[in-house]
């Protein structure tokens, strides 16, 4: 707590200006009116205050707004935002995307802090869903944002927002997240023609089921190996050699380099060696000729 002392004669701040960096902490406390500070928050960012001075300014705002700051103040917090705790932020009601952008700008270039995570959470909950503009903004600042959400949280993303997602935004997503996002992407891009559709859906294919992969194999899409390696193993296993060949097109040669890695390894184990040989890649490990393949999962289902 800063001691309550009288403001020295002639030092009462008439405006928030650059002279305040020369005030001691107790002078700021005594000479800066909290209401003046609140109305001139936009000036604070232009003035190189010390961290200790920022603490005093925050304290003044906390006293003025014990229930949480109004958005008119929040929007102009600037680097004072870095002084806020998640507990402070939970008191806020942030509804404007401009306010969100202004605060994310302050943290730009840094990892997502607990403050930022709380701010985003408050904002998204206030909106009820992750709309396209919000998603656009969040992924612009934090490309990995989408993949930081749980499958449950992702379920609130409307298909229309998927248009804002860039391939790099999905780099760190796991299969569970892609399982949720893929159907939304399929719906969002459904009216596009074949080649354009594939370009858009490609990043989401880690959540695609077998039947969709089979359908894609009929469309000359020439999927690259990097995308193929991210497909769900359980979706790849039922594909035939012919389907994989059509799916990959000229990239099929890349299977040889990946034959020890999932899902290629597991897929090879399910194919007849005769079929694999037709690719001419020297892939080994398929089912030898004359062997009978029993689908035990089907048998269990019948019993």
């Amino acid at each position: 707590e800063v001691e309550k002392t009288a403001c020295p004669s002639g030092k009462k701040a008439r405006e928030i200006d650059e002279s305040l960096i020369f005030y001691k902490k107790w002078e700021l406390e005594a000479c800066v009116d909290a209401a003046l500070l609140a109305t001139q928050m936009d000036r604070v960012n232009a003035i190189p205050f010390t961290y200790e001075q920022l603490d005093v300014l925050k304290h003044k705002l906390d006293e003025l707004y014990p229930q949480g700051y109004p958005e008119s103040v929040i929007q102009h917090l600037g680097y004072l935002f870095l002084k806020m705790s998640p507990e402070d932020i939970r008191k806020w009601n942030v509804t404007s995307l401009e306010t969100l952008k202004a605060l994310l700008e302050v943290n730009k270039g840094h990892e997502m802090s607990p403050q930022v995570a709380t701010l985003i959470d408050r904002f998204v909950k206030g909106r009820g869903q992750l709309d396209k503009d919000t998603l656009d903004t969040l992924t612009a600042f934090y490309p990995g944002y989408l993949c930081s959400l749980s499958p449950e949280e992702l379920s609130s993303v409307p298909p229309s927002s998927i248009w804002a997602v860039r391939p790099q935004d999905l780099d760190t997503c796991d299969p569970r997240q892609l399982d949720v996002l893929y159907p939304k992407a399929r719906l969002a891009f459904q009216n596009m023609n074949g080649s354009e559709y594939f370009v858009k859906i490609q990043s989401f294919l880690g959540g695609a089921p077998t039947e969709d992969l089979k359908a894609l194999s009929q469309q000359n899409v020439s999927m690259d190996l990097a995308t193929f390696m991210k497909l769900r193993t359980d979706a790849v296993l039922p594909l035939t050699v012919a389907e994989v060949q059509k799916l990959l097109g000229p990239h099929v040669e890349g299977l040889k380099a990946e034959e020890r890695h999932r899902p290629v390894r597991d897929w090879i184990l399910r194919q007849r060696q005769d079929d694999l040989d037709t690719l001419g890649l020297g892939l080994q490990g398929g089912i030898p000729n004359g062997y009978l393949v029993l689908d035990l999962s089907m048998q269990e289902a019948l019993s």
Partner: antibody, heavy 120, light 112 residues
């Protein structure tokens, strides 16, 4: 372009007061602070005081009791008033712009100065 | 108040030589915000002072790169790598970390 121009009386009698006006153009006094600096003949620079964008002031400790700086933003003018002048107050008086943003409180533009002689 | 001590008071140099001026402050010029508000000005004969270097080492617009500033805390240096005729005059260091602001006493750069 940025310009500062001082205007003063030239000659002041001992014990009288001095008033100098600094008229600026090319920028706003609501965005920049103004410092006053003086230089006795053949000597160094002495900082007198500053008026900040919000109207607050700081002064040279030794001269504080004799100095007063004010301004009129709408007229783009800054005023220096100095009381009880003595002969050793004879000097050239400069106003200079304090750029607290990009240049961090350096005085980036100066007036040409006005010469003040204290003599009876 | 912060006292700024400049050395030497006079610096005779030959054209093309390097010149070095020292400025020492009576207390640290590092502000609590991490910035060091130490500046250098040049006053040519019959002219107003002009800003050369701000915040220790940043050249003001139009200042040739033969001028460089360095230092930290309480010790600062202005260097001119190859002195030219137009560089002659009095150099002042100044601090705006603490109010009141203060100037050094000046160093006169003259031809040997």
């Amino acid at each position: 372009q940025v310009q500062l121009k001082e205007s003063g009386p030239g000659l002041v009698a001992p014990s009288q007061s001095l008033s100098i006006t600094c008229t600026v153009s090319g920028f706003s006094l609501s965005s920049y602070a103004i410092s006053w600096v003086r230089q006795p003949p053949g000597k160094g620079l002495e900082w007198l005081g500053v008026i900040w964008t919000g109207g607050g002031t700081n002064y040279n400790s030794a001269l504080k009791s004799r100095l007063s700086i004010s301004k009129d933003n709408s007229k783009s003018q800054v005023f220096l008033k100095m009381n009880s002048l003595q002969t050793d107050d004879t000097a050239r008086f400069y106003c200079a712009r304090n750029n607290y943003g990009r240049l961090d409180y350096a005085m980036d533009y100066w007036g040409q100065g006005t010469s003040v002689t204290v003599s009876s | 108040d912060v006292v700024m001590t400049q050395t030497p008071l006079s610096l005779p140099v030959s054209l093309g030589d390097q010149a070095s001026i020292s400025c020492r402050s009576s207390q640290s010029l590092v502000h609590g915000n991490g910035n060091t508000y130490l500046h250098w000005y040049l006053q040519k004969p019959g002219q107003s002072p002009k800003l050369l270097i701000y915040k220790v080492s940043n050249r003001f617009s139009g200042v040739p790169d033969r001028f460089s500033g360095s230092g930290s805390g309480t010790d600062f240096t202005l260097k001119i790598s190859r002195v030219e005729t137009e560089d002659l005059g009095v150099y002042f260091c100044s601090q705006s970390t603490h109010v009141p602001f203060t100037f050094g006493s000046g160093t006169k750069l003259e031809i040997k």
